[in-house]
């Protein structure tokens, strides 16, 4: 028996369902009584789901997994993982034993889009050209860790005096706070781009300083 999985990682959004594809080629006359299918976490070998002795043995992984029972006899051994969490990320092994056995691993990459950044300024009044200001760009509930880029109004990257911190919450999602310290010119726009490297999703925020009032 030869087991086939997708070479590319499966990307799943947090709180959605994901399908880890796995297939085998049944011989003529194959019956489910011959099939032994085990899904497990590749690294820890923790059992996730199994089908043995002719029946679905069910989920061994927080009751969020399911097979496609009607498709098993056609060689579809895919696993459905419901309500994906950050902690589900990793490699899953699909093991199939009929007369012979084979296995293959498929990677699950979890992702969550970042919120539109909010911009804050400190100080936020009585600003004069030449003042040092702190601009904070905050974006929430994303995964994995973001890449943050700052640019001025002409699109020139600002790399000096940038401090970025990322903190995971109890669900493993990241809140990102990036602080730019800059000396004000006569007027100017400062934009922050928060990029999710897996989703290739960009979230933009900007602040324009033109004397008073400020534009966000």
């Amino acid at each position: 028996v030869e087991v086939q999985v997708s070479e590319d990682p499966v990307v799943a959004l947090v709180d959605t369902d994901a399908t880890l594809r796995c297939s085998f080629s049944p011989e003529p006359g194959f019956s489910l009584a011959q099939l032994n299918l085990i899904w497990q976490l590749t690294d820890t070998k923790q059992l996730v789901h199994s089908f043995t002795e002719g029946r679905d043995q069910g989920s061994a992984y927080s009751n969020r997994t399911a097979l496609f029972p009607d498709l098993l006899v056609q060689g579809n051994a895919s696993l459905r993982l419901q309500r994906v969490r950050v902690t589900d990320e990793g490699s899953y092994t699909c093991f199939v034993s009929i007369q012979d056995f084979d296995s293959a691993a498929v990677s699950l990459q979890v992702a969550a889009p970042y919120s539109k950044p909010s911009m804050t300024l400190e100080p936020n009044k009585d600003l004069r050209p030449g003042n040092m200001v702190t601009i904070t760009c905050s974006s929430y509930q994303g995964y994995p860790e973001a890449e943050v880029f700052w640019k001025d109004g002409q699109g020139v990257p600002l790399t000096g005096n940038v401090t970025t911190s990322q903190m995971a919450n109890e669900r493993g999602l990241f809140d990102v706070h990036s602080v730019l310290r800059v000396v004000l010119g006569a007027n100017g726009t400062y934009s922050c781009l928060v990029r999710n490297p897996v989703l290739q999703q960009d979230a933009h925020g900007s602040v324009t300083i033109t004397g008073q009032p400020l534009t966000f």
Partner: antibody, heavy 119, light 109 residues
Framework: QVQLQQSGAEVKKPGSSVKVSCKAS????????ISWVRQAPGQGLEWMGG????????NYAQKFQGRVTITADESTSTAYMELSSLRSEDTAVYYC????????????WGKGTTVTVSS | EIVLTQSPATLSLSPGERATLSCRAS??????LAWYQQKPGQAPRLLIY???NRATGIPARFSGSGSGTDFTLTISSLEPEDFAVYYC???????????FGQGTRLEIK
Amino acid sequence: QVQLQQSGAEVKKPGSSVKVSCKASGGTFSSYAISWVRQAPGQGLEWMGGIIPILGIANYAQKFQGRVTITADESTSTAYMELSSLRSEDTAVYYCARGGSGSYHMDVWGKGTTVTVSS
Amino acid sequence: EIVLTQSPATLSLSPGERATLSCRASQSVSSYLAWYQQKPGQAPRLLIYDASNRATGIPARFSGSGSGTDFTLTISSLEPEDFAVYYCQQRSNWPPRITFGQGTRLEIK
């Protein structure tokens, strides 16, 4: 070509335990089935249990359940068989054997490890 | 647990003769059956797997047949080096537990 190198002969007291190792060289290890088979003097072959390292799941012959533990270390391509509560009837040659690619039949065998249980 | 019974226990033949060894399972093992040869002081050697497939390097005079509960190992024309003990082996579907027959001793007549 694949070879299975087993640890050396052991002499043990009744009631003690023995741990025999089996190191694979010259081929992949994790995705093959490893079995342990013993043969008492003048007797036939007796399967004790086996493991597929990639799965980490061992299973045992009913007769040895609770007394034998089979493990595999993928990082060193080594399988282990530990037999506890030894008695004189456990005196035998212990073989490790590897299945063919994706198979449970045993196409490569170690040379065997003699375990003698004597007070 | 499936029991394999081999017959005869001992078979006495001369070089050049045909040897037929039998292995009977107490219940169907499909075609999950293998045959091994063992000579004194040596580890067993795989001859046949999946009832009828010759293992790598095994001479064509060895052949296997059968399915379900009745299996046969045939050596078409015995060579002096073929005199040894022969074991059949099966495995259950899941978990993959293995049992051996008690062996057939093939001796020179």
